[in-house]
């Protein structure tokens, strides 16, 4: 019976134990439920061992315990003695759960101690969680505001841009107009001298003279005034272009030619002539402009193919294969005539083009353009 | 010697698109450019569209922007007009022109025959 | 966007009478200005360019004139093949090209 009574009050000191360590109910309240079961149970203990004495005193006093043999006396002292060490084990295991009583109240003040700090913190974070969503959606309405307004103003850059294009397109139309006024002024001033007159009467046949040492190949001459009409021969490859060489000793007078063809009735001539220089072939390199007496080149800003098309063909090739960009066959030497030259393509030469601007410092010669044309 | 040979006319409902054709010959399409010209029934001529080499692009008259596309196909040197949304307003002969720069204004020497489109319910 | 305005719309005159018609800018478009000639069921066909510039194969008898805002095609001495609708076209302004709204030269 004992045994099965301190079994059950083991167990419930678990339960109490267990309740105890996690927290269940009011800290303070437990503690003390789990002191007085504590305590009860011992002097339930006590009384029970005090119990257990007084038999044992009834019974040496009884005669029917004098009969006993020694091996009974022997058994109960052995019993006492289980008994005393199981009490100072008790008393043992009550000083161990004082300990741990101790240590639970220390702990729970520090729980209590977490708690509130944890509880302020939480405060903090919530308050600080707020404000931030205030910030948050204060900066939305910022973002927002200032979305519309990029909106805006990049609508207002757009019909900007298109009222710039058109300004820049109407003041160069007006340089453009100017330059070829001026241009028109100084022709007209140059052609004062270039006007040509009727065809002279026809001379007498002059004998053939002998013909002349021929020197080395020199620059092309001015075109001479046309001879017989002959078969037209394959255009043959433009020899590289030799250097100058003496003027040989003039030949007597030749016979006297047909009639030539009625000339086109225009005193002007192209203020442009334009050359191939550093290709492979005459049919390409870097394109050259005759212009004001002297030959420059052409930058690249907006060279493509239609501009090429245009200097193919005015130099007789059918069209253009490719068009180059940065100094693709060397730079050259000397002006950059024109920086920005459009063209739609059915021009008969670069001078029908829209040139910008003739004489450009907004370029170098690494920006040289050049063509090749078809053959 | 430009020649621009437009395809046949058509008739179109309310609402469709129509794509007209422009042939190139004599030229390729890549060393030319092709602007698109449209003359309604008894009425003047009104530009379209077409390359600019200023803006180095195609541009629009604002009339037509969003309505009209203008592509090319260099294989067969043909250029193409496509106009969408129609209505009876857009009835009209369509022309595709090539333009030269003479003396720094754009002019307009070859013509194609032109195509009469009819937007009819 | 420039507007073009031509006048008269339309006009009457015989074979061999000397006809001008006029074509005004709503501001200065320099010499950027073209004459164009339409027949009946036909393209367009460019006579003048750069306001006074003879386009190649086109007859002196047509001739152009004029700077700024004011511009003028004269036919010296008409021929019966003149007998057409003629535009005036501006590109100084661009994009848009812009024509004029046409004169149609009849038959008196």
């Known amino acids: 019976k004992w045994e099965t009574k301190n079994c059950s009050v083991s167990s419930t000191n678990a339960n109490d134990i267990t309740q105890s360590l996690t927290g269940k109910g009011n800290d303070s309240e437990e503690e003390m439920r789990f002191q007085e079961v504590f305590m009860e149970h011992m002097s339930n203990m006590e009384k029970r061992i005090q119990h257990i004495l007084d038999m044992e005193a009834n019974l040496m006093d009884t005669e029917h315990f004098q009969n006993f043999s020694m091996t009974t006396d022997q058994r109960f002292n052995d019993i006492l003695l289980q008994l005393s060490t199981l009490f100072s084990s008790v008393q043992g295991h009550g000083n161990a759960i004082d300990e741990i009583s101790k240590s639970l109240i220390s702990l729970n003040t520090t729980l209590l101690d977490l708690q509130l700090n944890i509880e302020n913190l939480n405060g903090k974070i919530q308050e600080n969680t707020f404000k931030q969503q205030e910030e948050i959606s204060k900066l939305e309405e910022r973002v927002y505001n200032v979305s519309a307004e990029i909106m805006a103003m990049k609508e207002e850059q757009v019909h900007l841009e298109q009222e710039i294009k058109g300004e820049v397109k109407v003041l160069n139309n007006i340089t453009n107009d100017l330059r070829l006024k001026d241009w028109e002024h100084s022709q007209t001033l140059r052609n004062i001298t270039l006007i040509q007159g009727p065809p002279g009467p026809p001379g007498e046949k002059g004998d053939r003279g002998p013909t002349g040492e021929s020197g080395p190949r020199g620059f092309p001459g001015p075109i001479g005034p046309p001879g017989l009409k002959g078969d037209r021969g394959a255009i043959g490859f433009p020899g590289s272009r030799g250097l100058p060489g003496y003027a040989g000793r003039p030949g007597n007078s030749g016979p006297k030619g047909q009639k030539g063809e009625k000339g086109s009735g225009n005193t002007l001539t192209p203020f442009t002539k334009v050359r191939l220089v550093g290709g492979s072939g005459p049919h390409e390199g870097r394109v050259e402009i005759l212009h004001s007496g002297q030959w420059g080149t052409i930058c690249d800003d907006r060279w493509e193919v239609r501009v090429g098309q245009v200097v193919c063909r005015s130099l007789g090739y059918p069209g253009v294969q490719a068009v180059h960009k940065a100094a693709h066959f060397g730079q050259g030497t000397g002006p950059i005539w024109l920086n920005e030259v459009f063209c739609f393509g059915r021009e008969s030469s670069i001078e029908e083009c829209k040139i910008r601007q003739w004489g450009t410092r907004a370029c170098s010669h690494s920006e040289d353009a050049g063509v090749t044309c078809t053959l | 010697q430009v020649q621009l040979v437009q395809s046949g006319a058509e008739v179109r409902e309310p609402g469709a698109s129509v794509k007209l054709s422009c042939k190139v010959s004599?030229?390729?399409?890549?060393?030319?450019?092709i602007h698109w010209v449209r003359q309604a029934p008894g009425k003047g001529l009104e530009w379209m569209g077409g390359?600019?080499?200023?803006?180095?692009?195609?541009v629009y008259a604002q009339k037509f922007r969003g309505r009209v596309t203008l592509t090319e196909d260099i294989s067969p040197d043909t250029a193409y007009m496509e106009l969408s949304s129609l209505t009876s307003e857009d009835t009209a002969v369509y022309y595709c022109?090539?333009?030269?720069?003479?003396?720094?204004?754009?002019?307009?020497?070859?013509w194609g025959q032109g195509t009469l489109i009819t937007v009819s319910s | 966007d420039i507007q073009m305005t031509q006048s008269p719309s339309s006009l009457s005159a015989s074979v061999g009478d000397r006809v001008t018609i006029t074509c005004r800018a709503s501001?200065?478009?320099?010499?950027?200005l073209n004459w164009y000639q339409q027949k009946p069921g036909k393209a367009p066909k460019l006579l003048i360019y750069a306001a006074s510039s003879l386009q190649s194969g086109v007859p002196s008898r047509f001739s152009g004139s004029g700077s700024g805002t004011d511009f003028t095609l004269t036919i010296s001495s008409l021929q019966p093949e003149d007998f057409a609708t003629y535009y005036c076209?501006?590109?100084?302004?661009?994009?848009?090209?812009?024509f004029g709204q046409g004169t149609r030269l009849e038959i008196k």
């Open positions: 022109a090539t333009p030269r720069y003479c003396n720094n204004g754009i002019c307009y020497d070859y």
């Open positions: 390359f600019d080499p200023e803006e180095g692009e195609t």
């Open positions: 004599g030229y390729t399409l890549t060393e030319l450019s």
């Open positions: 501001q200065s478009i320099s010499s950027y």
């Open positions: 076209q501006q590109s100084y302004s661009t994009p848009p090209i812009t």
